[in-house]
Structures are given as structure tokens and as C-alpha cells.
Amino acid sequence: FGISGRHSITVTTVASAGNIGEDGILSCTFEPDIKLSDIVIQWLKEGVIGLVHEFKEGKDELSEQDEMFRGRTAVFADQVIVGNASLRLKNVQLTDAGTYKCYIITSKGKGNANLEYKTGAFSMPEVNVDYNASSETLRCEAPRWFPQPTVVWASQVDQGANFSEVSNTSFELNSENVTMKVVSVLYNVTINNTYSCMIENDIAKATGDIKVTESEIKRRSHLQLLNSKAS
């Protein structure tokens, strides 16, 4: 039956988010084939007439590629043979958000899976002691967020406490007039405590922790993309 065989193959995608102005990865894996020349990968986007990307017979085939993706896409050619059809996307834009389809043909059959791709801006926060302030104050800064996130402070000692009355958050538009710098200040902090600054929008959640003791300051931060579910 060759590539026109009746069988369907398993194709798996993972919903993901792209950070605007950076590289993005649209993840897709499939049951591998032993011959690269028998594998066809097509990436499509809902509402877009041309293809996002096509890879067949061991190389990119871009004659049907939509202009909005020209020069912005590539598969990991050396990993296709092991079942990786993921797509690298250059300079992610807000308009790249949407539903993508990863469509695969191999000698074993064909299959496809959809992927929801969100776009925005997210960055790691950094929490520092603000020595310029008159009282014990913490300052949480994150350089790039979009859409506008919420900022919540928490403390290890005062779990469940509401810090909205003793904190002040501002959003400053960056020079490109899209993303914003997030600055949040927490007042009246106590020593020997760990404070967390949590920044969240519908794309990502980031946390910056600071532990202040008599002798040292320890910092830690992490970022998690939301809605990363496989399909």
C-alpha cells in the first residue's frame, strides 16, 4: 500500500506558547519510519491558505508555503527519522497565535493532530531588597509581559495573607509599545522570611522568591507555561 496505505499512525502535539520576538517551537512527534524519503510532514494553520511548512523526500518543499511564514520556519531535519516533526518558528508575532495541524504521511500510513498555539510575552522576575526605601522593602521586576498580568505577593510565614494593601504594582510600556515591564514593591517586610512575587497571565506564570535572613539573601525564580497539554 505504501504511503497511500489504509493505516493511521499516531501523531502527538503539545499545546504551547510563543514568546513574541523570539524563536518558538511547535511540538509534534509521530511513529518513526525507517526511510526518510517516505516521510512527509505538513504544517498547516487554520485560516491560512498556504502551508506553514512542508518537508518531504528528505528536504524542505516550500513551493506552497504561505508568505507570512516565508523564511521563518524549519524542521529539525536530522531528527525527522526518529519521529520528530517539531517546527521552529522565527520571530514569533502575536498574529502567529491559532490552531495548527501537524499532518504526517509515512509508509505505515497517515495521521494528524491539532495544536493550540498562544502568543504573548513572559519573562523571569527578579526580587531584590530595595535599600533606597525608608522601610524594609522588596522590589520585584520582570522586563517583558503581554497581555498585562496580575501580580500577587505571598509569604512562607504568613501563608494565606493578603498583601495587596502593602504592595504597589506598576506596568510600564516598553519602547516597542507592545510588551510591558512589571514592577511590584512590597512594604514592611520582616526578616527570616521567604517572600514570593507571582506574575501570571493566560500564557505563563512566573515566580520570584527571596529569602532574607540576618546573614544572607537567597533568590530563586522559575517560569511555567500554562495549558501545555498533549493531543
Partner: antibody, heavy 121, light 107 residues
Framework: EVQLVQSGAEVKKPGASVKVSCKAS????????IGWVRQAPGQGLEWIGD????????NYNEKFKGRATITRDTSTSTAYLELSSLRSEDTAVYYC??????????????WGQGTLVTVSS | DIQMTQSPSSLSASVGDRVTITCKAS??????VAWYQQKPGKAPKLLIY???TLQPGVPSRFSGSGSGRDYTLTISSLQPEDFATYYC?????????FGQGTKVEIK
């Protein structure tokens, strides 16, 4: 090893055209964009445009649109830059360069040796 | 079109000095900034791409940083072979653009 070998120096009269070639080897020619950059004597680098040999798609600096034509011959793995209506200000070293990232247009990571084009009456 | 404004246009430094060169994009924002080194009569050489990724084989004294519209190339300890002209390149958009160049000379 990626290699880009350019054609030799040219002397042209104002109003004439010049065609510079760039022969690629050491990689799959049709899978990577090739760009053209020029440098006038004592001046900086100026991006002219680029081509994706796999499909012949091109991009041009607005300044050169209508005067520069970038083409390729996949059978010989060669890219070409043709510049018409030459003037003295076009006297420069013309470089071809491979763009990193295959079908993804990356930075220029491998360069030809350059071709000096002199425009003089 | 995006323009890249590079500064300074030239600088004098000594071996061992820390050197910083900056490029400012006229608009937009993305991480697609590369840095090149060029010596007289030679083709440019890629040092750094995607703001801060060092090209294989390039010494670690070269580093890149930046975000938004402002980007920086730093040479932590200038070596004799580093005296050259440096260019930034914006390659995120359809139209690429180089900075005007910075000539690093011996003091």
C-alpha cells in the same frame, strides 16, 4: 566544509550591468538562503538582498529594488547577483554569504571571499 | 525599514581592556541581532547570533546581551588579534540591516 567561491574582479562603465557569481559547496545548496552584501571602499557593510535556492524566493533592500536581481542555478549550486544601471557609487566589494538555519532565515554564517566591482568611465 | 545605530564609530583601547559596543534598533523588538568582526581585506566573521549565542570556535571573551531595542557586544579582555571593525546585524525582519560599524584601534 561550507565553501562559497565568488567570480573575479570586474571593471564596468557607468550605465552598464554586472553579474557576480557565487558557487556553493559542502552543504545542500537548495536548503539554505544565500544573501548578498556590499562594502564600498572605507565604508560599512550594506545588505542588498537574499534568495532561497530551493524555491527562488527573494527579498531585497528597498534601495536596490529594480536595479538588483538575485537568481540561482540549482544544477551548478550557484547564486548570482546582477546589478544594472551602474554608477560610480556602486564601486564596492560584493560578498555572498550563506544564511544559517536552512529554510529559516538566520544570520550570515559563511562568507565568500568577495568580488571587487569597479565602476569607472 | 529598521535602522541599526551603532556606537561609538571608533574607539582606542589597550590590550586587556574591557570594550563595549552598542547597537540601537530604530523600532520593533526581537532577539535577532548578530555581531561580526572584520579585518582589512577580509570577509566578515560571525561572532554572536540571537543576541547572546556564541558561534562555535569564537573565544569566550566575546559576549552579547540586550533586549528590546538595545544590544551590546562586550570583549572582556581585549587581545592583540581583536583590533578590527565590528558590525551588528538585525536579521529578525524581512529586511536585514547592519549597523555602521565600530573600529577598535590600538591606543
Amino acid at each position: 566544509e561550507v565553501q562559497l567561491v565568488q567570480s573575479g574582479a570586474e571593471v564596468k562603465k557607468p550605465g552598464a550591468s554586472v553579474k557576480v557569481s557565487c558557487k556553493a559547496s559542502g552543504y545542500t545548496f537548495t536548503s539554505y538562503w544565500i544573501g548578498w552584501v556590499r562594502q564600498a571602499p572605507g565604508q560599512g557593510l550594506e545588505w542588498i538582498g537574499d534568495i532561497y535556492p530551493g524555491g527562488g524566493y527573494t527579498n531585497y533592500n528597498e534601495k536596490f529594488k529594480g536595479r538588483a536581481t538575485i537568481t540561482r542555478d540549482t544544477s551548478t549550486s550557484t547564486a548570482y547577483l546582477e546589478l544594472s544601471s551602474l554608477r560610480s557609487e556602486d564601486t564596492a566589494v560584493y560578498y555572498c554569504a550563506r544564511l544559517d538555519g536552512s529554510s529559516y532565515r538566520g544570520a550570515m554564517d559563511s562568507w565568500g571571499q568577495g568580488t571587487l566591482v569597479t565602476v569607472s568611465s | 525599514d529598521i535602522q541599526m545605530t551603532q556606537s561609538p564609530s571608533s574607539l582606542s583601547a589597550s590590550v586587556g581592556d574591557r570594550v563595549t559596543i552598542t547597537c540601537k534598533a530604530s523600532q520593533g523588538f526581537n532577539k535577532y541581532v548578530a555581531w561580526y568582526q572584520q579585518k582589512p581585506g577580509k570577509a566578515p566573521k560571525l561572532l554572536i547570533y540571537y543576541t547572546s549565542t556564541l558561534q562555535p570556535g569564537v573565544p569566550s571573551r566575546f559576549s552579547g546581551s540586550g533586549s528590546g531595542r538595545d544590544y551590546t557586544l562586550t570583549i572582556s579582555s581585549l587581545q592583540p588579534e581583536d583590533f578590527a571593525t565590528y558590525y551588528c546585524l538585525q536579521y529578525g525582519n524581512l529586511l536585514y540591516a547592519f549597523g555602521q560599524g565600530t573600529k577598535v584601534e590600538i591606543k
